[in-house]
Amino acid sequence: AGVFELQIHSFGPGPGPGAPRSPCSARLPCRLFFRVCLKPGLSEEAAESPCALGAALSARGPVYTEQPGAPAPDLPLPDGLLQVPFRDAWPGTFSFIIETWREELGDQIGGPAWSLLARVAGRRRLAAGGPWARDIQRAGAWELRFSYRARCEPPAVGTACTRLCRPRSAPSRCGPGLRPCAPLEDECEAPLVCRAGCSPEHGFCEQPGECRCLEGWTGPLCTVPVSTSSCLSPRGPSSATTGCLVPGPGPCDGNPCANGGSCSETPRSFECTCPRGFYGLRCEVSGVTCADGPCFNGGLCVGGADPDSAYICHCPPGFQGSNCEKRVDRCSLQPCRNGGLCLDLGHALRCRCRAGFAGPRCEHDLDDCAGRACANGGTCVEGGGAHRCSCALGFGGRDCRERADPCAARPCAHGGRCYAHFSGLVCACAPGYMGARCEFPVHPDGASALPAAPPGLRPGDPQRYL
């Protein structure tokens, strides 16, 4: 994980003839802002993918008013950096798009309008943790000067932010098999994080989250000793009568030696005999150099200038393994939030968001009623990623634009006749009934079931329903 940072230095007219007119005027003051979109890889297909590495929008710059007759100068810029966090490995090669937008501060209805002044794009190689890279891009008559870098978020380090580093426990050296973390020589490369609770003495892992047992130990966390005292053989049978525990798999079961190495058991563990060109505890380090092109699927090879120094493949999104040979099912990590549908397009990950949510990972909960107008005095009611209008009397439909027929639901009881009225409806009750909806019978002695008839109304009079 890490952050891509973009610093805009200047935006103004480029050199040469045909200087652009200022985008702002005394009549129409404006301010600038920028947006950056990042995509992994240098391939042509990156142009067709969405901003899979992320995107960021700057703050608005200071308000600028052009002085009449003056040439367009470099325009005032927003403060601060544009920062695009990335969660996975930094791909090493990337494509960018930087948009320069103008926000006009006149009296437009519906808020200030935006216009796109310039859009620049490029493809670059960049190692994480390196210095700021400077760039100049031209779009028409405009020129944009900027710097960028990628930096890892601790504890990640390295040119792809894939290595983890921890402060050194002993002052002089790192633990067995662990290298110092260049350039942080006072830190050590962290070991793989095994399954939580995996015994540090009797378990080990080759993949994060697993726990494999050394000989003599078993159980999910390698904490259960295998009893051999009454078993038929050192790796005795599973038997309830003998009291033997089922041993874990033997240390050579499944062949832990990579790259065609052969495994032999030792009293404590195992030993790999590696084929020529490979070395390491599990033959995982090869004498192959980057010149041999060992990284598949567009992986970026780093180090390994000679056979005695290991190379590392920095894999593009969607691939993993020491040589980027394995395809990752990135949707299994459920990156889309709020019920979004995950689509692994190969070159990019895409989330299709449910109504009411947006963002690259559906992380933004949109205000259901923002910008939603309910007509004819209706009010907007939020709910469940959608909006609905609670309409004033006499109106209906999604946005309260339709005139409702108040008599459609036959609201007058006991055979009363319904008449539409500008303020609602009126019921003309049949003889023997009264009330706003003719719901009350009139008793024979002239009294009604109502506590009291409204003053000025006789039973049988039309009653307006308000």
């Epitope: 929008l57 309008a113 933004h364 910008g371």
Partner: nanobody
């Protein structure tokens, strides 16, 4: 799924006007950026402008500012592009596009950010 159908294109004299419509069906699109791109023969698809997903505000390419206006009628699920003072270099196929992203700020000016597209309508401006 969202289906988009453009209409209103045709042949017009320089200085004239046209109004293009983009009718959306399949899902309510009030939460979508609805924008227009154009593509002249042999050229890349170019952002023209449209309305943002977030608040419906208009966004323009600088080259059409003051001549083109964008609007939408959410009740009819339709977006409009009103073009006036047309010039011969406005000749192109005009495409309507829609997407829920980005959730704030102006709509994207990049074609790859849009999932839904119409088939386009031809606008020819003669001199």
């Amino acid at each position: 799924q969202v289906q988009l159908v453009e209409s209103g294109g045709g042949l017009v004299q320089a200085g004239g006007s046209l109004r293009l419509s983009c009718a959306a069906s399949g899902r309510t699109t009030s939460r979508y950026s609805m924008v227009w791109f154009r593509q002249a023969p042999g050229q890349e698809r170019e952002f023209v402008g449209g309305n943002s997903a977030h608040d419906g505000r208009s966004a323009y390419a600088d080259s059409v500012k003051g001549r083109f206006t964008f609007s939408r009628d959410n009740a009819k699920n339709t977006g409009y592009l009103q073009m006036s003072s047309l010039r011969p270099d406005d000749t192109a196929v005009y495409y309507c596009a829609a997407d829920t992203n980005p959730p704030y700020g102006p709509p994207w000016s990049t074609p790859s950010e849009y999932e839904y597209w119409g088939h386009g309508t031809q606008v020819t401006v003669s001199s």
